[in-house]
Structures are given as structure tokens and as C-alpha cells.
């Protein structure tokens, strides 16, 4: 339903917002090293990248329940 | 054997309804979610509609929706497929078959024509 | 919605070469679960669809190695090989990435 895909969507977005500040937080707790803000930097643009990527899905996701089983029944023909 | 028997399909006037039947056996039927897909004379394939493994959600393709409804009994084993308003572009076989296109029924034709 | 366009429209194919066919999707096919939902099926003269490969390259129960599908994100390839007299039908790509869910336009395989 429009719901269940609306709740979905929210939830992964608020989801990787939380991984991302907690991750920038744990990160900026770091001394300042090259490498450290060289994996800041990562995670800024990790986040950034799949931003763009949600951006370019012109239609919405079909929801779980309408995927592949993760049992297969018996097939009934064969090629 | 794993079966999709489709039934209830004929001859309708613009405007008229069906109801198209897919009796299942052969596989734990309340398990799949089911999805029934038509094909028009000398065309390709249309996804029409899904429903849920346990009834409760279904989609609709836009070009039937509002007009197809689409029911299960998993008491009987059996997918339903109300048509109202038919028009002479639903002319086609209809498809009954399990989510990931795994196994299919033979098919039951509609013909909408006055 | 998205459009898949298979290429080429028809081929003719002597028994025992190999066959390919294209599928291009209108946008990428990854879910938000990880998977790609994309999927090849055949309909042979007068019979009902079967399906082929599922999740791309994951052949279904009982067909027979001769058909390989590859390919990722927009564009996808079956490959047949050693083609024999009984793979005439039209093959048909589909994605159940996306709702509503949608076919390539077919691709008719005829054996000389």
C-alpha cells in the first residue's frame, strides 16, 4: 500500500540520517588526523551518493510482500 | 503437480463484468502472494494486479484500476479477478500466476465486443 | 513506469549456434532490499509463458544450462547456446523491481 511504502521509505531515511550523525559523531571524536578526516569525508559522500542514487528511482519499490519467495514452490514446467 | 487452472472467461458487451477463477493445488497456495497478468492478441505481456499471501494488499496496474478487484480464498485455494467495466481493450488471455512468475495457468480468454 | 526495450526484435538462428538478446531497463533494477528483481521467460507457439531466469542469472527448476543470463543494474543479456529446435518462441524480459511491474516488448526466436 502507499502507506506501508510512505512508512518504509521514512523509516530508511531516518535510519541512514541516524547512522550517518552517529558515525560523523564518533568520527569527530577522533583526534584530527589526515585519516580521520579522510573517513569523514567518506561517510559524507557514502551518504551524499545514495541521496543522489533514491533521486534517480522514478517509480516506487515494489513492496516486499510482492517479491521473490524465499521458498520457490515446484515448478510445473520446465523449458 | 503444481497446478493454476484458470476459469470464467467469454464472450462480455463494453460495459459488462466478469469474474475470472484460478483454482490451485499442488503447492502450499496461502503461502504466495498470486498476481494475474493478461495478454492481448498478438501482444506482449501486462501485469494487471498482486495480492498478498493472506489477502490484505493488493496493486493495481492503472489501466485496471478502479475497475478490476482482485480476491482470494485460501480456504478453497482459489484467486478471483472481478472485472467491471469492461471495455473492448481488455480483450486478451488472462493469466493466474505466483509472485516471481514461477509457475502459470493456461490462461482463460475474454473477448469484450459488442 | 519503467521501460524495458529488448533488442533485437527477431532473429533466425540455425541449430546449434548460439543466440543473444538484450534487455536495456529505463532505470536501474536494484531494489532497496539489494536484490535485482529482473527475470527471462519464454512462450513457445500456442503455450502459456514459463519462466527461465530469475534475479538475473539464477536459472529456474528444470531449464537446461544452455541458458545463461548476466548483466546488472540497466542492461541485461540472455545467451543461448547451442540453440536447439524446441527454444523457438518469443523470450520475454520483465522487472519486479518497480510497480507496476513491466515486459520487455518480446523478442521472437525463429530456428531454420
Known amino acids: 500500500s502507499e502507506a506501508e511504502d510512505a512508512s518504509l521509505l521514512s523509516f530508511m531515511q531516518g535510519y541512514m540520517k541516524h547512522a550517518t550523525k552517529t558515525a560523523k559523531d564518533a568520527l569527530s571524536s577522533v583526534q584530527e588526523s589526515q585519516v580521520a578526516q579522510q573517513a569523514r569525508g567518506w561517510v559524507t559522500d557514502g551518504f551524499s551518493s545514495l541521496k543522489d542514487y533514491w533521486s534517480t528511482v522514478k517509480d516506487k519499490f515494489s513492496e516486499f510482500w510482492d517479491l521473490d519467495p524465499e521458498v520457490r514452490p515446484t515448478s510445473a514446467v520446465a523449458a | 503437480e503444481l497446478q493454476l487452472v484458470e476459469s470464467g472467461g467469454g464472450l462480455v458487451q463494453p460495459g459488462g463484468s466478469l469474474r475470472l477463477s484460478c483454482a490451485a493445488s499442488g503447492f502450499t497456495f496461502s503461502s504466495y502472494s498470486m498476481r494475474w497478468v493478461r495478454q492481448a492478441p498478438g501482444k506482449g505481456l501486462e501485469w494487471l494486479s498482486s495480492?498478498?499471501?493472506?489477502?490484505?494488499?493488493?496493486s493495481y496496474a492503472d489501466s485496471v484500476k478502479g475497475r478490476f478487484t482482485m480476491s482470494r480464498d485460501n480456504a478453497k485455494n482459489t484467486l478471483y479477478l472481478q472485472m467491471n467495466s469492461l471495455k473492448s481493450e481488455d480483450t486478451a488471455m488472462y493469466y493466474c500466476t505466483n509472485q516471481g512468475y514461477i509457475n502459470w495457468g493456461q490462461g482463460t480468454q475474454v473477448t469484450v465486443s459488442s | 513506469a519503467t521501460m524495458l526495450t529488448q533488442s533485437p526484435g527477431s532473429l533466425t538462428i540455425v541449430p546449434g549456434e548460439s543466440a543473444s538478446i538484450s534487455c536495456r531497463a529505463s532505470?536501474?533494477?536494484?531494489?532497496?532490499?539489494?536484490?535485482?528483481?529482473f527475470y527471462w521467460l519464454l512462450q513457445k507457439p500456442g503455450q502459456r509463458p514459463q519462466l527461465l531466469i530469475y534475479?538475473?542469472?539464477n536459472r529456474e527448476s528444470g531449464v537446461p544450462d544452455r541458458f545463461t543470463g548476466s548483466g546488472s543494474g540497466t542492461d541485461f543479456t540472455l545467451k543461448i547456446s547451442g540453440v536447439k529446435a524446441e527454444d523457438a518462441g518469443v523470450y520475454y524480459c520483465?522487472?519486479?523491481?518497480?510497480?507496476?511491474?513491466?515486459f520487455g516488448q518480446g523478442t521472437k526466436l525463429e530456428i531454420k
Open positions: 534475479q538475473v542469472s
Open positions: 520483465a522487472q519486479g523491481t518497480y510497480n507496476p511491474k513491466t
Open positions: 532505470q536501474s533494477l536494484i531494489h532497496s532490499a539489494g536484490k535485482t528483481y
Open positions: 495480492i498478498k499471501s493472506d489477502g490484505s494488499i493488493t
